[in-house]
């Protein structure tokens, strides 16, 4: 059993989640990658790249865009116009078969809340990144990064078991609470 630290990202409705999933290019450069959401115990594949992966050939499925950079060992995931119902646990995986996927670390717990003014994308910007400087408050410090390790609430004592044949991955003691500021 491999223990993963779940990272929590807080967004407002209408914003864009942009993550990068890191992989060993020697192993997985030519593999298909997928973005999945955990629904109960079973993951649901939301989008997957073509095979073989090629640089700068984005795959778009609704509001999700995947762009693989096999030369750099990175998969870029964009989820635009986030909605409250998008909240949940997401993972990048190496997609080998619908029932068999290798999880790329770390899982992301996405929390989407209504904008303070009640309108989607009510922040200055609708795309955003994460602040990188530790902060003693939960205050949003700037649009591109988040305060790593700014705990905005008591981390839940939870364990999520990802159902992938041959391996059980437990997500325990969510400690990396990330506050994501905004930019349009």
């Amino acid at each position: 059993t491999t223990e993963l630290t779940e990272e929590k990202y807080e967004y407002k409705e209408g914003q864009t989640l942009e993550v990068k999933c890191d992989y060993a290019l020697e192993k997985y450069a030519n593999s298909r990658k997928a973005w999945q959401k955990m629904e109960g115990k079973m993951p649901k594949i939301l989008a997957k790249t073509e095979r073989p992966s090629e640089n700068s050939h984005p795959v778009q499925v609704g509001r999700i865009t995947l762009e693989d950079y096999p030369d750099h060992g990175l998969l870029q995931v964009r989820m635009t116009n986030l909605q409250v119902e998008d909240s949940g646990l997401y993972q990048c995986v190496i997609y080998q078969h619908p029932k068999e996927s290798h999880v790329l670390f770390n899982p992301i717990c996405l929390v989407v809340t209504k904008g303070s003014s009640g309108t989607p994308g009510s922040s200055e910007n609708s795309t955003q990144n994460v602040y990188r400087t530790p902060s003693t408050t939960a205050k949003a410090l700037g649009p591109r990064y988040t305060s790593p390790r700014t705990v905005t609430q008591a981390p839940p004592e939870s364990t999520v078991v990802v159902s992938t044949p041959g391996s059980e991955i437990n997500l325990t003691n969510v400690t990396d609470i990330i506050r994501v500021p905004v930019f349009n």
């Epitope: 990272e7 942009e18 993550v19 990068k20 999933c21 890191d22 992989y23 060993a24 290019l25 640089n55 700068s56 762009e67 950079y69 030369d71 750099h72 060992g73 990175l74 870029q76 995931v77 964009r78 670390f105 770390n106 992301i108 910007n125 795309t127 990144n129 994460v130 990188r132 400087t133 530790p134 649009p143 591109r144 990064y145 988040t146 790593p148 390790r149 990330i178 930019f183 349009n184």
Partner: antibody, heavy 122, light 107 residues
Framework: QVQLVQSGAEVKKPGASVKVSCKAS????????INWVRQATGQGLEWMGR????????GYVQNFRGRVTMTRNTSISTAYMELSSLRSEDTAVYYC???????????????WGQGTLVTVSS | DIQMTQSPSSLSASVGDRVTITCQAS??????LNWYQQKPGKAPKLLIY???NLETGVPSRFSGSGSGTDFTFTISSLQPEDIATYNC?????????FGGGTKVEIK
Amino acid sequence: QVQLVQSGAEVKKPGASVKVSCKASGYTFTSYDINWVRQATGQGLEWMGRMNPKSGNAGYVQNFRGRVTMTRNTSISTAYMELSSLRSEDTAVYYCARGGRTSIWSFVFDYWGQGTLVTVSS
Amino acid sequence: DIQMTQSPSSLSASVGDRVTITCQASQDISKHLNWYQQKPGKAPKLLIYDTSNLETGVPSRFSGSGSGTDFTFTISSLQPEDIATYNCQQYDKLPLTFGGGTKVEIK
């Protein structure tokens, strides 16, 4: 405070290799990418690639692929960039720079090492 | 690769002048653009990230704007300590690319 401290200047012969180190302090080393950027005298900045210190996975710009290797030692919070088969045009200042968090699509270089001059001359 | 074209390549202005530098991307990069200041013999220093956000500790006379392919960096009132080369950098797509730099001098 966050600091990146690089190893000293190097003089190398064509065909040799050089390994530059970058020691990080003041933050959690494994939470942020380390990038390498070089600058030849009087020239612009050129990104060479990035490494995720947590996983050790790295990716390189095409111009350098096959010649560059980026590694790390997490126990001493140090990143390394090794460039092999050196030629005169590799003479440049090599910088390490901290990028965004490893899981976020952010390549904003907020802290830089002081630079290491690598001179390639016969 | 995305090409970043900076202009002018150099400029000379008086203390107190408003200085504007432009950076043009060869394709849409949204707001994924950063600006750095580099003084001779020193490492670059982040000034502006994501087009318009001022890095902590950077004087408010520096600002940035733009979106898509056209971006502007402004020094509202040039100071003697602003003598440096300024570089833009995009990170919308890999590989990351920098502009050619703009050298700012005092008249």
